[in-house]
Amino acid sequence: SEVEYRAEVGQNAYLPCFYTPAAPGNLVPVCWGKGACPVFECGNVVLRTDERDVNYWTSRYWLNGDFRKGDVSLTIENVTLADSGIYCCRIQIPGIMNDEKFNLKLVIKPAKVTPAPTRQRDFTAAFPRMLTTRGHGPAETQTLGSLPDINLTQISTLANELRDSRLANDLRDSGATIRIG
């Protein structure tokens, strides 16, 4: 069954998928599609990489990690309820029927807006409140607590750092990961 990931409306959703290249720069084509992985390829392709680069993507779908090191995790920007569904990450390993397929279930819930305090001290009111950190069983969420006063540019930077530092290891542990070679 699919591993479940969650986000709230208006957030960026993150669907982890990883592989380990046989050698640095020795990349494998990857496709992401909406819908469960079919026998071949991806249905309703939203993003695709080849041996060198991202060669196809659609609005709001991008790879935020270092795909040259095998981090092909998908970010979906500014999600709505209609982004809920099964997503397929397919690592297209050369050879007959060698592909690795991962079905990831994304569930979007309505955003919960908390009344803003007089002075904006709560990071979570200015940026998505919950970030999924584990994929097994019921989606565990990590709520980000109070931080010092920061402006919007800092929020964006801080969000990236938080995701990269605090979540990447957790997600790598719990997400779709394979080693090649």
Partner: antibody, heavy 119, light 107 residues
Framework: QGQLQQPGAEVVKPGAAVKLSCKAS????????MQWIKQRPGQGLEWIGE????????DYNQHFKGKATLTVDTSSSTAYLQLSSLTSEDSAVYYC????????????WGPGTLVTVSS | DILMTQSPSSMSVSLGDTVSIICHAS??????IGWLQQKPGKSFKGLIY???NLEDGVPSRFSGSGSGADYSLTISSLESEDFADYYC?????????FGGGTKLEIK
């Protein structure tokens, strides 16, 4: 998929309040948001609001703020819609509906409760 | 509020026909649309969600399509149980808003 049960009808006097119930069974009550909808003949459908039974978080249609209050009782897997200061304009069928597995907000509906405001 | 304009308001059709009902939103709703069926004197049943997906147990003769602000529900090879009222609903924005409904009648 589960079931939603609602009483068939309620008759209430103008100015009074009424609390409508929607009893859920056959699914995990706290996992799915509940919607409430009003239907008046010739007036179409109006969305009243929604509630997350896991933490009682609510979103309301501004038109129903002060008129409608959404609550849940997780111990009995029941959602409630309370309507206050009733007038003839509140005479309608009120439905609860719950979301489906992929965040479809109006997947499964209760049978509705006909509220008649009459002296 | 997002206005959902549904057309036609009623149509007379025959068994076996294929019909389409249209909903136009007053802005882009990014496939955040559902289609509902209400039989006379009964409650509602969800048919389609997120523009194109069938709810559980809904026959494959029902289908949804569209993008942006324009969406449609198509029923192919109409059966007697399909004569009912149909509504669209958007849920991209609060408040959720419904179309005015389409009554499907037997010719």
């Amino acid at each position: 998929q589960g079931q939603l049960q609602q009483p068939g009808a309620e008759v209430v006097k103008p100015g009074a309040a009424v609390k409508l119930s929607c009893k859920a069974s056959g699914y995990t009550f706290t996992s799915y948001w509940m919607q409430w909808i009003k239907q008046r003949p010739g007036q179409g459908l109006e969305w009243i609001g929604e509630i997350d039974p896991s933490d009682n978080y609510t979103d309301y249609n501004q038109h129903f703020k002060g008129k409608a209050t959404l609550t849940v009782d997780t111990s009995s897997s029941t959602a409630y819609l309370q309507l206050s200061s009733l007038t003839s304009e509140d005479s309608a069928v009120y439905y609860c509906a719950r979301e489906g597995a992929f965040s479809s907000p109006f997947a499964y509906w209760g049978p509705g409760t006909l509220v008649t405001v009459s002296s | 509020d997002i206005l959902m304009t549904q057309s036609p308001s009623s149509m007379s059709v025959s068994l076996g026909d294929t019909v389409s009902i249209i909903c136009h939103a007053s802005q882009d709703i990014r496939s955040n649309i559902g289609w509902l069926q209400q039989k006379p004197g009964k409650s509602f049943k969800g048919l389609i969600y997120h523009g194109t997906n069938l709810e559980d147990g809904v026959p494959s003769r029902f289908s949804g399509s569209g993008s942006g602000a324009d969406y449609s529900l198509t029923i192919s090879s109409l059966e007697s149980e399909d004569f009912a009222d149909y509504y669209c609903v958007q849920y991209v924005q609060f408040p959720r808003t419904f179309g005015g409904g389409t009554k499907l009648e037997i010719k």
